[in-house]
Interface confidence: low
Amino acid sequence: SGVFQLQLQEFINERGVLASGRPCEPGCRTFFRVCLKHFQAVVSPGPCTFGTVSTPVLGTNSFAVRDDSSGGGRNPLQLPFNFTWPGTFSLIIEAWHAPGDDLRPEALPPDALISKIAIQGSLAVGQNWLLDEQTSTLTRLRYSYRVICSDNYYGDNCSRLCKKRNDHFGHYVCQPDGNLSCLPGWTGEYCQQPICLSGCHEQNGYCSKPAECLCRPGWQGRLCNECIPHNGCRHGTCSTPWQCTCDEGWGGLFCDQDLNYCTHHSPCKNGATCSNSGQRSYTCTCRPGYTGVDCELELSECDSNPCRNGGSCKDQEDGYHCLCPPGYYGLHCEHSTLSCADSPCFNGGSCRERNQGANYACECPPNFTGSNCEKKVDRCTSNPCANGGQCLNRGPSRMCRCRPGFTGTYCELHVSDCARNPCAHGGTCHDLENGLMCTCPAGFSGRRCEVRTSIDACASSPCFNRATCYTDLSTDTFVCNCPYGFVGSRCEFPVGLPPSFPW
């Protein structure tokens, strides 16, 4: 990088005329356009590949140009370049007449040109000015030029850059000879490579700044020595990245199927015994005196309706006591002093004599029970609904309203989405609370194992630079574990110029 400097010194246009020979009115208000470009044996139009610069109006007809700012323009004129100076150049200097204040090319008539000079040749970098003078029939231009290096550039071609910096492109200061000296924590030819946190795993970690430890895909922890389980893994661990090895009592591809509800949730109350009966399913066996799906309800001794023949039950500290209606006696009012002649059967019950009329029995119509058909049948008393189903009396019958996931007259059947064998190609079906999941055999994928895939994503050796390849069996994709000094999804990038990582 450097600057081509052009010092305009004197312009002579004694007759005050344009290139066409036409005189300027009132005089030639002269400004210059400069085009610097690559060497051409014959200088021709085309891009000013090294740069362009224009001056303001510097004078009228003939004038000398001062060595400092003049009307807002600089002298010498600066044409900076940001490449290695090739040592050769072409230079076009045009003198133009400005009738008005607008100096833009499109604002000037094409015949406003006063003169045009074009030179080409060799030019070495240096402090010394080359003086030149170009004369045409009507004008003369005296000028000098040179090429110097920009600050922080050195060498015959201004190609040796050394500028202290502390950014993405390097972290160094410059030595007197232009060589680099790395800042603490940085290494490498251009001091771009950070020295990572001590102990950072050399395969699984890397860093973008000193004393840092960033983990490659599949690894975590302060030193990147802990693997990351598969995305979605709930109750599982890994020994290499993207595994999901289930903890005790859990199952399924993501270890999210509870195979031990009893242990994990202890749902049975009041000392009941819990038995696992499938995924998220259990049965509580209640101790005497308790009832309910989770044995959460304490039974009253009267709850079992021990008093017969319309006797009323009273709870007592040491048990219960039956108050018998007229005509009955006994602990449970089970003995009668009545006969069929006393019409003891209620609610349309039929009376049948027994023991030669000393006793009787009532035959009750549907929906009634008891020795005298005095009780309306409550078909829910015996808690016939399994798996937490709710019992409902419906006239002469009862029905069970089942919890989600259960069916059958008594909610005794677990609803199975797997019953219709939805998993293709020998996939294993798992019932979930809200549906099902297929675990596919090797070589198949998709929600129902319907997609045939390659069995081993690593078979094609997709990883570069001797990286280790892991196959993610749940998605049939691969993960590359890069050796030290390489990054990227396939370990294709050297760490020296880290790309922007997608993780």
Epitope: H38, Q40, P45, G46, P47, C48, T49, F83, E106, P110
Partner: antibody, heavy 119, light 108 residues
Framework: QVQLVQSGPEVKKPGASVKVSCKAS????????ISWIRQTPGQGLEWMGW????????DYAQKFQDRITMTTDTSSTTAYMELRSLRSDDTAVYYC????????????WGQGTLVTVSS | EIVLTQSPGTLSLSPGDRATLSCRAS???????LAWYQQKPGQAPRLLIY???NRATGIPDRFTGSGSGTDFTLTISRLEPEDFAVYFC?????????FGQGTKVEIK
């Protein structure tokens, strides 16, 4: 909008000349140059040269230097490209495209003119 | 003359895929002088990218140009059906101005 409209297809015999026109509209014609590019199945896209509508200066590719002439008519905002001593390998679609010295690209392009050279 | 070599010659991809086209110059080219064009059958080329990385007016932001020196890249982040075409790079730093031989992006 900026538009370049070219003349129609031409069929020529070897040794003849062809002159293709390119009518510009939608911008100040003299602020830009016109480049000519041809496309042959064998050679792909090939730049032939350009002309400044501002001052008429031209820059021809050396390959065509001795048999090409580019001109402009600022009054009708039209550019012309004449190619002489035609050969069969000059069969191509010839495009004009707007170009400016400080914008180093071609935009827009004309629709193209097919020139067929055949005996 | 500067030779621009484009690779690959043909790219077979599906809609939604990412396309990466390369243009390598036989010698260093200032980025300001490198452009990319798209051409569909029976049509003139259309400017996509100028100055190596600037999108032309009306060009969607899925088109990105990058690079400097001798290596330049055109990236199409997600291919749309209308993007299947031939793409050319072009330099105007040194005369004669030259084009690459083109990369055809076709539907797989």
């Amino acid at each position: 909008q900026v538009q370049l409209v070219q003349s129609g297809p031409e069929v020529k015999k070897p040794g003849a000349s062809v002159k293709v026109s390119c009518k510009a509209s939608g911008y100040t014609f003299t602020y830009y140059g016109i480049s000519w590019i041809r496309q042959t199945p064998g050679q792909g896209l090939e730049w032939m040269g350009w002309i400044s509508a501002y001052d008429g200066n031209t820059d021809y590719a050396q390959k065509f230097q001795d048999r090409i002439t580019m001109t402009t008519d600022t009054s009708s905002t039209t550019a012309y490209m004449e190619l002489r001593s035609l050969r069969s390998d000059d069969t191509a679609v010839y495009y004009c495209a707007r170009y400016s010295w400080n914008k180093h690209w071609f935009d827009p392009w004309g629709q193209g003119t097919l020139v067929t050279v055949s005996s | 003359e500067i030779v621009l070599t484009q690779s690959p010659g043909t790219l077979s991809l599906s809609p939604g895929d990412r396309a990466t086209l390369s243009c390598r110059a036989s010698q260093s080219v200032t980025g300001s002088y490198l452009a990319w064009y798209q051409q569909k059958p029976g049509q003139a080329p259309r400017l996509l990218i100028y100055g190596a990385s600037n999108r032309a007016t009306g060009i969607p932001d899925r088109f990105t140009g990058s690079g400097s020196g001798t290596d330049f890249t055109l990236t199409i982040s997600r291919l749309e059906p209308e993007d299947f075409a031939v793409y050319f790079c072009q330099q105007s730093a040194f005369s004669p101005w030259t084009f690459g031989q083109g990369t055809k992006v076709e539907i797989k």
